[in-house]
């Protein structure tokens, strides 16, 4: 029992439990397909424990294997709307450093208005994750419809 | 190696590994949009280790950040059926205590017959999670098509 | 602080952090609906830490509760294509040993071109997971569109 107490007294950072859950702040300007995220208890149920935000993009602070998950819902959208607009695609990837640039997760909306997925991937300290939304429909900013997060799983 | 043995001898509860995976029991009466869940080894592959069921709703026993996930499939459904019965929406939220009531996760089926998603969210001991299905199509009770679960991730 | 260092010196295997993320290798021959997977750092961002591949199927090495996740995207697909080739279904299950054969996760594509889901399930050492894709559309081999993984969560 003493061990469990000792374990809880350790700073969580030393256990490597980096985790973040973000909500949509805004979309990028004309030629920038990136979504810009925000997080923190003042904003509701979003948070960052370990990772940080760098100009709205998520930067990793600890090497390891992470579970990356995302849901994006298009605003004012129906299956008819979706089919009447340019195909909307979401891609999550490492966008910096440039030497590690790669697409990790990609989904198209087709006639749907929401995409949601998750995957395990190795990430390194300093990796910045970008979420690129291409298409002409606006993503919802409702916090229960659009969110993005990572969870450190193991070294 | 001794440490690893010692760790495994600790009650898992002290490590905070609360986890549950539930299967659909039944839908609510006429004016009740909630899905009612069940879990336990006697039922198949569902289980509750830490959280409990309170009248078919999942109650959290340990504070922390949780990964909440859900999949719901509509029974006897095709894209034609789904579009004719639109809109069908699923929302997962904290429904009690009332002071903490909030929608955590929301998805519409549009022309599809299955929704699946997951997110990280802080939950507190005593929070009860409800899953509200609005629409006129019945959810499948097949255990590989409809399920709902939570996993404690960190304090 | 000494404890944290000691913990990190332990072999991760003893902590039970089995994890795998796989990419699609190929589909099966005519009468075999199974997808065949591959993993390893030489292939990109896929890996196996604990579980193993047995003829393209994932074999579990440690008893416990696992988070199983999958995303499959159909190649050269649009909502029109998908609806004309209906039904395409993906099922993840234990396929051996035969005595434990069961479907864990099932999704239909309907008018969409991607399915993605995840669930918690108990798995035992020796369980082999198979992913069966029925339908006439080929799955994409792009590593950001089609992947399959497991993560050990607790004993």
């Amino acid at each position: 029992q003493r061990f469990a107490q000792a374990q809880q007294q350790l700073p969580l950072e030393s256990l490597g439990w980096d985790v973040a859950e973000l909500q949509l702040n805004h979309t990028g300007p004309q030629q920038d397909p990136r979504l810009y995220w925000q997080g923190g208890p003042a904003l509701g149920r979003s948070f960052l424990h370990g990772p940080e935000l760098d100009k709205g993009q998520l930067r990793i602070h600890r090497d390891g294997i992470y579970m990356v998950h995302i849901q994006v819902t298009l605003a004012i959208c129906s299956s008819t709307t979706a089919s009447r607009h340019h195909p909307t695609t979401l891609a999550v990837g490492i966008c910096s450093p440039a030497s590690r640039s790669i697409s990790l997760l990609r989904l198209s909306f087709h006639q749907g208005c929401t995409i949601a997925s998750q995957r395990l991937t190795p990430l390194a300290r300093g990796d910045t994750l970008c979420t690129n939304l291409t298409g002409t429909l606006l993503p919802s900013r409702n916090t229960d419809e659009t969110f993005f997060g990572v969870q450190w799983v193991r070294p | 190696q001794r440490f690893a043995q010692a760790q495994q001898q600790l009650p898992l509860e002290s490590l905070g590994w609360d986890v549950a995976e539930l299967q659909l029991n039944h839908t609510g009466p006429q004016q009740d949009p909630r899905l009612y869940w069940q879990g336990g080894p006697a039922l198949g592959r569902s289980f509750l280790h830490g959280p409990e069921l309170d009248k078919g709703q999942l109650r959290i026993h340990r504070d922390g950040i949780y990964m909440v996930h859900i999949q719901v499939t509509l029974a006897i459904c095709s894209s034609t059926t789904a579009s004719r019965h639109h809109p069908t929406t699923l929302a997962v939220g904290i429904c009690s205590p009332a002071s903490r009531s909030i929608s955590l996760l929301r998805l519409s089926f549009h022309q599809g017959c299955t929704i699946a998603s997951q997110r990280l969210t802080p939950l507190a001991r005593g929070d009860t999670l409800c899953t509200n299905l609005t629409g006129t199509l019945l959810p499948s009770r097949n255990t590989d098509e409809t399920f709902f679960g939570v996993q404690w991730v960190r304090p | 602080q000494r404890f944290a260092q000691a913990q990190q010196q332990l072999p991760l295997e003893s902590l039970g952090w089995d994890v795998a993320e796989l990419q699609l290798n190929h589909t099966g021959p005519q009468q075999d609906p199974r997808l065949y997977w591959q993993g390893g750092p030489a292939l990109g961002r896929s890996f196996l830490h604990g579980p193993e591949l047995d003829k393209g199927q994932l074999r579990i090495h440690r008893d416990g509760i696992y988070m199983v996740h999958i995303q499959v995207t159909l190649a050269i697909c649009s909502s029109t294509t998908a609806s004309r080739h209906h039904p395409t279904t993906l099922a993840v299950g234990i396929c051996s040993p035969a005595s434990r054969s069961i479907s864990l996760l099932r999704l239909s594509f309907h008018q969409g071109c991607t399915i993605a889901s995840q669930r918690l399930t108990p798995l035992a050492r020796g369980d082999t997971l198979c992913t069966n894709l029925t339908g006439t559309l080929l799955p994409s081999r792009n590593t950001d569109e089609t992947f399959f993984g497991v993560q050990w969560v607790r004993p």
Epitope: Q30, S83, H86, T136, L138 | - | -
Partner: antibody, heavy 119, light 111 residues
Framework: EVQLVQSGAEVKKPGASVKVSCKAS????????IHWVRQAPGQGLEWMGD????????SYNQKFRDRVTMTRDTSTSTVYMELSSLRSEDTAVYYC????????????WGQGTLVTVSS | DIVMTQSPDSLAVSLGERATINCRAS??????????MHWYQQKPGQPPKLLIY???NLESGVPDRFSGSGSGTDFTLTISSLQAEDVAVYYC?????????FGGGTKVEIK
């Protein structure tokens, strides 16, 4: 640079039809919906409908549904708006317009085409 | 259809003074974390020009004396310091649902 260039002014008799063209340049034609908005002399703006050039699907304001047809020619990056059974109250300047990145508001406009319906 | 009511119909303001135009929607045009209200300026013989989108976002190239505010059903376009070149008709437009509709316009003149 995004440009929308419309066809010239038209004079039509009541009961006739008019077909106004809008030629797009400076961007990928099939990506962005083209909307049509009209303005009667000294009056406000009225949304008529839009077309997605990618597949030709159009959505019309219920007010014009029975009389308006929007089409596109991807080979010339041109959208057409045809209004039939013309009446005097259809006398207006007809604009084609395009949004910038997300649909819903119009950052680019054609120069307008005056359609006069008179017997 | 959502009806957009602009007020006043016309407005005379001295150069350098503030001009305020209101637009009321017959029902809320706010959803999904946005207010789907946009503002345009139109000068005689020209097509409308986008000034503000999503209630408060300034379109690129538009002077920052223009600003927008509001949510739900009530919205305001403000010109903080009227210039001679701001003489025009101003329209609000919603895109909450189809059909999109415009307000009747407000004519801004110099006093």
């Amino acid at each position: 640079e995004v440009q929308l260039v419309q066809s010239g002014a038209e004079v039509k008799k009541p009961g006739a039809s008019v077909k106004v063209s809008c030629k797009a340049s400076g961007y990928t034609f099939t990506t962005y919906n083209i909307h049509w908005v009209r303005q009667a002399p000294g009056q406000g703006l009225e949304w008529m409908g839009d077309i997605y050039p990618g597949n030709g699907d159009a959505s019309y304001n219920q007010k014009f549904r029975d009389r308006v047809t929007m089409t596109r020619d991807t080979s010339t990056s041109t959208v057409y708006m045809e209004l039939s059974s013309l009446r005097s109250e259809d006398t207006a300047v007809y604009y084609c317009a395009r949004f910038s990145r997300f649909d819903g508001w119009f950052a680019y406009w054609g120069q307008g085409t005056l359609v006069t319906v008179s017997s | 259809d959502i009806v957009m009511t602009q007020s006043p119909d016309s407005l005379a303001v001295s150069l350098g003074e503030r001009a305020t135009i209101n637009c009321r929607a017959s029902r809320s045009v706010s959803t999904s974390g946005y207010s789907y209200m946009h503002w345009y300026q139109q000068k005689p013989g020209q097509p409308p020009k986008l000034l503000i989108y999503l209630a408060s976002n300034l379109e690129s190239g538009v002077p920052d004396r223009f600003s927008g505010s509001g949510s739900g059903t009530d919205f305001t376009l403000t010109i903080s310091s009227l210039q001679a070149e701001d003489v025009a008709v101003y329209y609000c437009q919603h895109s909450r649902e189809l059909p999109y509709t415009f307000g009747g316009g407000t004519k801004v003149e110099i006093k």
